[in-house]
């Protein structure tokens, strides 16, 4: 399955005092996602 999650830099979306627009990109930068093969705790979401 193709991973529908994009890999944009969440840091670009966060500004001090404007954290309302922050993006949760932790899954894309998780240990699990870094593992290229085998079962992962963060499978791609469909």
């Amino acid at each position: 399955l193709a991973d529908p999650l994009d890999h944009r830099d969440a840091g670009d979306l966060w500004f001090p005092g404007e954290s309302e627009s922050f993006e949760d990109a932790h899954v894309e930068h998780s240990i699990s996602r870094s593992l290229l093969e085998g079962e992962i705790p963060f499978p791609p979401t469909s």
Partner: antibody, heavy 114, light 112 residues
């Protein structure tokens, strides 16, 4: 097998310093965002620091309770993250975990007492 | 700060019966890309926390499907369809959308 192994904890007097390490293995480290979370005895979890990847200019973020006293860093060549803790207070006494939010280490205990 | 609250704080359960834990955030956890940044962890006695649910409703790998997560922008629920003895421990909700990241106070689940 993914492993996160913390070390460097111990007994230190108030005002003292400690440097914690978290050696990782079993996964490509360089693009992973890492965190330190602590837990005082019998209490809940408290997030304290976060470091992003080289592609994010190693951006760092801290909880107010440790800002200006603690510094998170990483060495991608050693696949290790660190937490330099200065001006330690008795309320910093806790088990310190390194985590990618999915995997967690076993923790290292820091005790600040005179 | 985004304050996370949980209820109940203590939950006696009967094996084989369902159980439910509620979590509320003081601000919406719905971020861009319609992703809700609500995570659930279980910390078993003497162990490190383990991930159960990420982004409100996604089951982490290796987690039994008797666990499920649901909710809206500020109100969330973790359900266990049939509690087993190994499910005892402290359950925490957490948000990783806004700094500082915050955890709920925890719900202690114990067998009656």
């Amino acid at each position: 097998e993914v492993q996160l192994v913390e070390s460097g904890g111990g007994l230190v007097q108030p005002g003292g310093s400690l440097k914690l390490s978290c050696a990782t293995s079993g996964f490509p480290f360089s693009n992973v965002w890492m965190h330190w979370v602590r837990q005082a005895s019998g209490k809940g979890l408290e997030w304290i620091a976060h470091i992003k990847a080289k592609s994010d200019n190693y951006a760092t973020y801290y909880a107010e309770s440790v800002k200006g006293r603690f510094t998170i860093s990483r060495d991608d060549s050693k696949t290790t993250i660190y937490l330099q803790m200065n001006s330690l207070k008795t309320e910093d006494t806790a088990v310190y975990y390194c985590t990618g939010l999915d995997y967690w280490g076993q923790g290292t205990t820091v005790t600040v007492s005179s | 700060d985004t304050v996370m609250t949980q209820s109940p704080l203590s939950l006696p359960v009967t094996p084989g019966e369902p159980a439910s834990i509620s979590c509320r955030s003081s601000k919406s956890l719905l971020g861009v890309r319609d992703i809700t940044s609500l995570y659930w962890y279980l910390q078993k006695p003497g162990q490190s926390p383990q991930l159960l649910i990420y982004r409100m409703s996604n089951l982490a790998s290796g987690v039994p499907d008797r666990f499920s997560g649901s909710g809206s922008g500020t109100d969330f629920t973790l359900k266990i369809s049939r509690v087993e003895a190994e499910d005892v421990g402290v359950y925490y909700c957490a948000q990783f959308l806004r700094y500082p990241y915050t955890f709920g106070p925890g719900t202690k689940v114990e067998i009656k």
